[in-house]
């Protein structure tokens, strides 16, 4: 089936915004009023995965952008990037492990787990304006639960 | 050599669990996922859930509230049990494995175990 | 859910006949549509994924065709051993459906 995807923005749960640092990197930084416009809006595509009763396989790629977040090893270590692809072939309902989140709702709060590296989840530090990151823990300093919210396409 | 094996009482009374393990060799319960389908007798196939390499499980919803499936790796083990058995639920059960093949054939199910009869009477 | 319709529930045929057998998913499916045979009192087997791919093993006179909603499985000439019943199964997306199964038959 053609790939089903809808536009969204996303806040951590301390309400933190999410916007572009350069060409290749998100941060997380607190935004109000006008500046909310800076923030940026992700085409969440539903795609094939290793699905679930309680996960929901997405890959998250930047509203009329070539750039999709992605999860490789970077120095042995599990790594968040922003990877450029080719416009033609994406989105696609079977999109390479690399780009699949597993999008895990619990107390009206989402995670995004890394399908390539399990139980590893896109993070944002208490600090004001650092990257977003791969976490490898859940529940201590980093912040993994995001609010969604819904943009009319 | 892929093989898959499905072992259970083939008897089971009505309003008991009716519990089956898969054991498998060839391949590793880590890597791939592993699906129970079942077919009532001189019926068709229907799928009942499955089982991922993460552990991570989905079950197919009419029977999602009686159901847990299950896997121990190490034994290459995978179990499923289903609660509150009526007569409708007599049939032949069977395993098999993933494809797993991500980015392009995921969801399929390529080798399967011969399957075990159950039937659920008193 | 996806609902899949084969047809025809029953068929039977000669050996050295052609047959086809079809499946109509109820949304878009691609090409995620596989094709099982299965005789009595065994398992079944995958002999073809991904619409037309046949599966390693498999004999040249099966073939698959379909993109989307409709599918077509094909036995170019029938041989003793291919009188068994075949089912289709979606693999898009879960739950997985299977079609009804149709049962071919020595004529």
């Known amino acids: 089936a053609p790939v089903r995807s809808l536009n969204c923005t996303l806040r951590d749960s301390q309400q933190k915004s999410l916007v572009m640092s350069g060409p290749y990197e998100l941060k997380a930084l607190h935004l109000q009023g006008q500046d909310m416009e800076q923030q940026v809006v992700f085409s969440m595509s539903f795609v094939q995965g290793e699905e679930s009763n309680d996960k929901i396989p997405v890959a998250l790629g930047l509203k009329e952008k070539n750039l999709y977040l992605s999860c490789v090893l970077k120095d042995d270590k599990p790594t968040l990037q922003l990877e450029s692809v080719d416009p033609k072939n994406y989105p696609k309902k079977k999109m390479e492990k690399r780009f699949v989140f597993n999008k895990i709702e619990i107390n009206n709060k989402l995670e995004f787990e890394s399908a390539q590296f399990p139980n590893w989840y896109i993070s944002t530090s208490q600090a004001e304006n650092m990257p977003v990151f791969l976490g490898g823990t859940k529940g201590g300093q980093d912040i993994t639960d995001f609010t969604m919210q819904f943009v009319s396409s | 050599e892929v093989q898959l094996q499905e072992s259970g009482p083939g008897l089971v009374k009505p309003s008991e669990t009716l519990s089956l393990t898969c054991t498998v060799s060839?391949?590793?319960?880590?890597?791939?996922?592993v699906s129970w389908i079942r077919q009532p007798p001189g019926k068709g196939l229907e799928w009942i859930g499955l089982i991922w390499g993460s552990g991570d499980t989905y079950y197919n919803s009419p029977l999602k509230s009686r159901l847990t499936i299950s896997k121990d790796t190490s034994k290459s083990q995978v179990s499923l049990k289903l609660s509150s058995v009526t007569a409708a639920d007599t049939a032949v059960y069977y395993c098999?494995?993933?494809?797993?093949?991500?980015?392009?054939?995921?969801?399929?199910?390529?080798?399967w175990g011969q399957g075990t009869l159950v039937t659920v009477s008193s | 859910d996806i609902q899949m319709t084969q047809s025809p529930s029953s068929l039977s045929a000669s050996v050295g006949d052609r047959v086809t057998i079809t499946c109509q998913a109820s949304q878009d499916i691609d090409d995620d549509l596989n094709w099982y045979q299965q005789k009595p009192g065994k398992a079944p087997k995958l002999l073809i994924s991904l619409a037309s791919i046949l599966r390693p093993g498999v004999p040249s006179r099966f073939s698959g065709s379909g993109s989307g909603t409709d599918f077509t499985f094909t036995i170019s000439s029938l041989q003793p051993e291919d009188f068994a019943t075949y089912y289709c199964l979606q693999s898009d997306s879960f739950p997985l459906t299977f079609g009804q199964g149709t049962k071919l038959e020595i004529k």
């Open positions: 098999a494995k993933q494809t797993n093949l991500w980015a392009y054939d995921l969801y399929s199910m390529d080798y």
């Open positions: 060839g391949f590793s319960l880590s890597d791939y996922g």
